[in-house]
Amino acid sequence: NKILVKQSPMLVAYDNAVNLSCKYSYNLFSREFRASLHKGLDSAVEVCVVYGNYSQQLQVYSKTGFNCDGKLGNESVTFYLQNLYVNQTDIYFCKIEVMYPPPYLDNEKSNGTIIHVKGKHLCPSPLFPGPSKP
């Protein structure tokens, strides 16, 4: 039996930050679980991990080069990615493992979310014309 995951098909990070919500067909309340976010078509880079345990507060691991935090809902984990770079535009996949109670469960591969990171563009300073000549 596999957990199903729903993600937005695409998100745009205008201010170099984005909230990606992973919605699961499973209630995480009172479970020991590991939710993770993976970058790339082959999911080769694990960007962020959120670990939940009924007996302690949420723990978050963020890979070097990514500023990440997580928030838990009953059937969702939202990843908050900040300080993203334009070259981190890619497809990101949500994964979930439930370790306790048995049986161990994980998810069917989701369709992923394309995160498009828009670069910050500095606005040109307004031109102040000099004093007009009489």
Partner: nanobody
């Protein structure tokens, strides 16, 4: 900070044995999957073996099955790789890796969160 330190590498003749150790510090080791990878000169890092949190479940790459055995001692925060019937093609730098808060026997290097510095294993013919 999490640290992984490998030891036990060295030079051995073909057919010989070595036991690698990887000591971890900086976290509660018993909630993590541990893995061994290796990298030969000019080649990509490849998966060798992994062990789950309890030590009851293991996974191996095909070329080492029946020759290598991974184990762990959660009281000592240490994972081991017993390597028997070594072959010249086992020559590589061996790395241990830690996958946080998991029970999934991952085989991709990108699915591991922390790495040791590696220990050299050389098998002479």
């Amino acid at each position: 900070e999490v640290q992984l330190v490998e030891s036990g590498g060295g030079l051995v003749q073909a057919g010989g044995s070595l036991r690698l150790s990887c000591a971890t510090s900086g976290r509660t080791f018993s909630s993590d999957v541990m893995g061994w990878f290796r990298q030969a000169p000019g080649k990509e890092r490849e998966f060798v073996a992994a062990i789950n949190r309890s030590g009851h479940s293991t996974s191996y790459t095909g070329s080492v099955k029946g020759r290598f055995a991974i184990s762990r001692d959660n009281t000592k925060n240490t994972v081991y790789l017993q390597m028997n019937s070594l072959k010249p093609e086992d020559t590589a730098v061996y790395y241990c890796a830690l996958r946080l808060w998991s029970d999934y026997l991952a085989q991709k290097s990108g699915e591991y969160n922390y790495w040791g510095q590696g220990t050299q294993v050389t098998v002479s013919s």
